[in-house]
Interface confidence: low
């Protein structure tokens, strides 16, 4: 059971494949580590975000680089290969029967990808089966231009989906975060992610996760009992990558879910989250679209208090200040609210137990024609010690059966100007959202109207 030997880097000819979805050939494998290290790493991490249109924030408030701009820049840097792991693709408005000018950024991205293929740059896409976007033709259009596309049958393999959202560019640059390959992620949904530039060690580690998807995308693929050694990770929570990011001493590693897609050395995503929570001594701030201490996709649902217990233990046992900001939109399941209220009920300032829960409501405004939008879709957590940026919602299935990834970064304070660590930048973004008028305490939420902006 071996990875097929792929073509040499940069030799895949665009538009020179059958016009059907690509199955047989592999994407160009990343360069050998020795080759990569000839080009010295100078890692740089940039937080990126999407703010839905017509969602003004206070003047002077902190912000991250716009996601659409970052994605287009990342594609501009590409010289040899772009590997994309994605839940689904829907970059054009008519995919979902919508004619809205806010889809143009997604269409610009699709245009850029077509141009990339024209430059003989290899594009490999691992995407989910099952998929949400049954009417999208983005991938057929890219395949016609020479992209390699594999659908990873997670439904058959683990009874989940491929929920990851990351790119590896030239084996040197990375995007990962909450945003799907969806025009709404650029203009209509609140997202958060990170771009890491010039960091071949981390990029090639994340590439190994991409390759786990890639080999499972061939017909009749089965999960291996043990992943071959070339899928193993050298970076994990016990031995993170150590490097300088813009001169700042940094440790970082990628986690993955589900356990079946964690070869040797890969930290499980849930373990990474729990480790970050467990090391916090001052605060844990988390911004997630969904929070359920249960399963979500198994019937009957099971109770699953792992993350809930960890937050309670941190607040109750160590006096850590816990803040949870949860997405709230027209498609939010109202059965989530009792769990949020239960968590909040633990709060007892007199006993130094601080647990606060708010929901973030994006006003729909005149965008009601756009389905599954106008929501906080972020999946991140920050403590005084570390930043965690993920692709998973917080319920059991995302960690047990669904493919996702997480990034854990810790930067040393004091070695740079105040406020420059990644965790400090992320804390500022969280606090901007937490203190905004769109973040509403549970007390202000009337049942049945939980996610309608009251203005």
């Amino acid at each position: 059971w071996q990875v097929p030997r792929p073509p040499t880097w940069g030799q895949v000819q665009p538009k020179d494949v059958p016009r059907s979805w690509e199955h047989g050939s592999s994407p160009a494998w990343e360069p050998l580590e020795a080759e990569a290290r000839q080009q010295r790493d100078s890692c740089q991490l940039v937080l990126v975000e999407s703010i839905p249109q017509d969602l003004p924030s206070a003047a002077g408030s902190p912000s991250a680089q716009p996601l659409g701009q970052a994605w287009l820049q990342l594609l501009d840097t590409a010289q040899e290969s772009v590997h994309v792991a994605s839940y689904y693709w829907s970059l054009t408005g008519p995919d979902i029967g919508v004619n809205d000018s806010s889809s143009q950024l997604g269409e610009a991205l699709l245009q850029k990808l077509q141009q990339l293929l024209g430059r003989n740059i290899s594009l490999a896409v691992a995407t989910s089966s099952p998929t949400l976007a049954r009417t999208s033709t983005d991938l057929q259009v890219l395949a016609a231009r020479g992209a390699h596309v594999r659908q990873v049958p997670m439904g058959r393999l683990t009874r989940g989906v491929l929920h990851s959202k990351f790119w590896v560019v030239d084996g040197r640059h990375i995007y990962m975060g909450s945003a799907n390959m969806d025009w709404r992620s650029l203009t209509q949904v609140k997202e958060l992610g990170a771009v890491i530039y010039n960091c071949s060690h981390l990029a090639q580690d994340l590439e190994k996760t991409f390759q786990t998807y890639w080999v499972l995308g061939v017909p009749k693929a089965v999960l291996p009992k043990t992943w071959p050694q070339n899928f193993s990770s050298h970076f994990n929570r016990f031995q993170p990558f150590h490097g300088l990011f813009d001169g700042v001493p940094t440790t970082a590693y990628f986690s993955a879910s589900p356990p079946a897609l964690c070869p040797q050395g890969r930290t499980r995503d849930l373990e990474a989250l729990l480790a970050v929570m467990g090391s916090a001594q001052e605060f844990i701030y988390a911004s997630v679209m969904e929070y359920f201490p249960t399963t979500r996709f198994s019937h009957p649902p099971r109770y699953w208090p792992v993350l809930d217990n960890a937050l309670r233990a941190a607040a109750f046992g160590k006096g850590v200040r816990v803040r949870l900001l949860v997405g709230c939109g027209l498609n939010t399941d109202p059965t989530m609210f009792p769990y949020l209220r239960s968590l909040q009920a633990l709060s007892n300032p007199a006993a130094n137990v601080s647990v606060d829960v708010k929901v973030f409501i994006v006003p729909v405004g005149n965008h009601s024609n756009i389905p599954f939008s106008r929501v906080n879709h972020s999946k991140f957590m920050v403590t005084e010690k570390a930043a965690y940026i993920g692709t998973s919602n917080w319920s059991e299935d995302y960690f047990s059966s669904t493919a996702g990834v997480g990034l854990v970064v810790t930067q040393s304070p004091g070695a740079q100007p105040a406020g420059a660590t990644v965790q400090e930048q992320l804390r500022q973004l969280f606090e901007r959202d937490w203190s905004s008028r769109y973040a509403v305490g549970l007390d202000g939420q009337a049942p049945g109207q939980d996610c309608v902006w009251q203005g």
């Epitope: 016009r19 033709t137 057929q140 016609a144």
Partner: antibody, heavy 118, light 107 residues
Framework: QVQLQQPGAELVKPGTSVKMSCKAS????????MHWVKQRPGQGLEWIGD????????NYNEKFKSKATLTVDTSSSTAYMQLSSLTSEDSAVYYC???????????WGQGTSVTVSS | DIQMTQTTSSLSASLGDRVTISCRAS??????LNWYQQKPDGTVKLLIY???RLHSGVPSRFSGSGSGTDYSLTISNLEQEDIATYFC?????????FGGGTKLEIK
């Protein structure tokens, strides 16, 4: 503004070849596909193929694979199409067109009229 | 190859009329449908791309719609300068293919 300049006409003999040009200006030549389209007198439009000047990557309509050869000169921002072994069937107007958003041909040249006659 | 069919090869209308030109693909082209205008002097212009997106500089009296295999171009208020032949083109699957054209004339 985007402009594609093509010579107006070419008169050529059967069995020979012709190489027509399309000079682009007003945009980054190497970032957009260049399409070539044939129109016989009183007929519709037929796509011949396209070329990406940033890499010389090409696509051809199977029907024109042995007839047309697409090339570019990036230093002069000029695309070329050579037609070989000409017959009267090749008498037509040939247009170059820039491949814009989502492969729509957003700007067209004025066309070169090729007449094959002995 | 995908066949593009414009069933009406010529159409007569009066100035000020609302005119609709239709185009059918031999298979689903997922909105990758473009419309071009060719004037009698041979000049070709893109009017609408991706079914309904108006190309820059094109008057708003032109609009496009459709999905799957059936598409149409509408001119809401016919003007003299709209006298031309109109072609549809699919951009979903190589090779790109055009409809046979619909020639628009004044009554």
């Amino acid at each position: 503004q985007v402009q594609l300049q093509q010579p107006g006409a070419e008169l050529v003999k059967p069995g020979t070849s012709v190489k027509m040009s399309c000079k682009a200006s007003g945009y980054t030549f190497t970032s957009y596909w260049m399409h070539w389209v044939k129109q016989r007198p009183g007929q519709g439009l037929e796509w011949i193929g396209d070329i990406y000047p940033g890499s010389d990557s090409t696509n051809y309509n199977e029907k024109f694979k042995s007839k047309a050869t697409l090339t570019v000169d990036t230093s002069s921002s000029t695309a070329y199409m050579q037609l070989s072994s000409l017959t009267s069937e090749d008498s037509a107007v040939y247009y170059c067109a820039r491949g814009g958003w989502l492969d729509a041909m957003d700007y067209w040249g004025q066309g070169t009229s090729v007449t094959v006659s002995s | 190859d995908i066949q593009m069919t414009q069933t009406t090869s010529s159409l007569s209308a009066s100035l000020g009329d609302r005119v609709t030109i239709s185009c059918r693909a031999s298979q689903d082209i997922s909105n990758y449908l473009n419309w071009y205008q060719q004037k009698p002097d041979g000049t070709v212009k893109l009017l609408i791309y991706y079914t309904s997106r108006l190309h820059s500089g094109v008057p708003s009296r032109f609009s496009g719609s459709g999905s799957g295999t059936d598409y149409s171009l509408t001119i809401s208020n016919l003007e003299q300068e709209d006298i031309a032949t109109y072609f549809c083109q699919q951009g979903n699957t190589l090779p790109w293919t055009f409809g046979g054209g619909t020639k628009l004339e004044i009554k």
